[in-house]
Interface confidence: low
């Protein structure tokens, strides 16, 4: 005889940590290993992300949840969930498609990520470089000549640096 | 549902900048990465970079780095790209693309062309 | 960069065929691979990430495979609707780098 069928989905109770297995008269069957289903009345189970190579493992896999991976030392994470990890780099340099590169003169980068930024131009505000700058550090710009009296030593803090990676605007 | 709706075609002169925008709505801003890829006529998809729309840093692939900037406004949920100093091979369709292991959604795209 | 390199270029097909596309990667990218579907004047959409995992709402009829260097997408019984331009991407590292594009046409 032809069974009734359920009005309600019998997938639907069917909780994470398993799937509705239409080859089973949609049964509720565990996620098979490697693989997970964060919620309820899945049909099929998520393959748990791998953390190869350059990745590294910061949680393991469970049959509700996927791993969670970052990156090894030397790399550091990009994007939600770290779905990159990108090579670091020392202060003064930039990483090129060749590799870690020093910053070019007139350039500095203060982080491990990120590309060499120009220093500061401080005869645009009419201010005197008060100290150089190097690859690691931007120049401090200082009151110019001019504006100096008796008296005054007032320093101006450099700018705000930009976000880490932008390019100059 | 998750939507992306950038901002619509321009013509620029060579020399000028470009300032591209995609909205996102339907979901979390925060919670994925926006990356931008373009298609000149006729040609395959180029990655051009993405932003953690969290931090607001930026990754720009290496033939874009000093003429691409990425930007974002969480309280409006918009990313940005601009792209400056054009020239006529950047004639093309700009797509921006939520990321979350793959480019899983996509803006219409915004057709850029180049011309004097 | 990893190289994605994808065949054929183009091919003909009839409704119902079964079609192969495949993507060779130039380094190992583990499974760190997506194919999206192309109309013209159209976005691309995700069809496959992590190799064989269908995005939402993708027809079982396509399905993805491979891991290391070797991917292949497979249309079981190619529809109407299916001609279209195909792009395999690996994200294993960055750059992301997409491959060159599969043209499929009416034959």
């Known amino acids: 005889f032809e069974r009734t069928r359920s009005l309600q989905d019998p997938c639907s109770n069917c909780p994470a940590g398993t799937f509705c297995d239409n080859n089973r008269n949609q049964i509720c069957s565990p996620c098979p290993p490697n693989s997970f289903s964060s919620a309820g009345g899945q049909r099929t189970c998520d393959i748990c992300r791998q953390c190869k190579g350059v990745f590294r493992t910061r949680k393991e896999c469970s049959s509700t949840s996927n791993a969670e991976c970052d990156c090894t030392p030397g790399f550091h994470c990009l994007g939600a969930g770290c779905s990159m990890c990108e090579q670091d780099c020392k202060q003064g340099q930039e990483l090129t498609k060749k590799g870690c590169k020093d910053c070019c003169f007139g350039t500095f980068n203060d982080q491990k990520r990120g590309i060499c930024r120009p220093w500061t131009n401080c005869s645009l505000d009419g201010k005197s470089v008060l100290v150089n700058g190097t690859k690691e550090r931007d120049v401090v710009c200082g009151p110019s000549p001019a504006d100096l009296s008796p008296g005054a030593s007032s320093v101006t803090p450099p700018a705000p640096a930009r976000e880490p990676g932008h390019s100059p605007q | 549902q998750v939507q992306l709706v950038q901002s619509g075609a321009e013509v620029k002169k060579p020399g000028a900048s470009v300032k591209v925008s995609c909205k996102a709505s339907?979901?979390?801003?925060?919670?994925?990465?926006m990356h931008w890829v373009r298609q000149a006529p006729g040609q395959g998809l180029e990655w051009m970079g993405w932003?953690?729309?969290?931090?607001?840093?930026?990754t720009y692939a290496d033939d874009f780095k000093g003429r691409v900037t990425m930007t974002r406004d969480t309280s409006i949920s918009t990313a940005y790209m601009e792209l400056s100093r054009l020239r006529s091979d950047d004639t093309a369709v700009y797509y921006c693309?939520?990321?979350?292991?793959?480019?899983?959604?996509w803006g219409q795209g915004t057709l850029v062309t180049v011309s004097s | 960069d990893i190289q994605m390199t994808q065949s054929p270029s183009s091919l003909s097909a009839s409704v119902g065929d079964r079609v192969t596309i495949t993507c060779k990667a130039s380094?190992?990218?583990?499974?760190?691979v997506a194919w999206y579907q192309q109309k013209p004047g159209k976005a691309p959409k995700l069809l496959i990430y992590?190799?064989?995992i269908r995005h939402t709402g993708v027809p079982s009829r396509f399905s993805g495979s491979g891991s290391g260097t070797d991917f292949t997408l497979t249309i079981s019984s190619l529809q109407p609707e299916d001609f279209a331009t195909y792009y395999c991407?690996?994200?294993?590292?960055?750059?992301?780098?997409f491959g060159g594009g599969t043209k499929v046409e009416i034959k």
């Open positions: 693309a939520r990321y979350d292991y793959a480019m899983d959604y």
């Open positions: 932003i953690n729309t969290e931090t607001g840093e930026p």
């Open positions: 339907g979901y979390t801003f925060t919670d994925y990465s």
């Open positions: 991407q690996q994200r294993y590292t960055t750059p992301p780098t």
């Open positions: 992590w190799a064989s």
């Open positions: 380094q190992d990218v583990s499974s760190a």
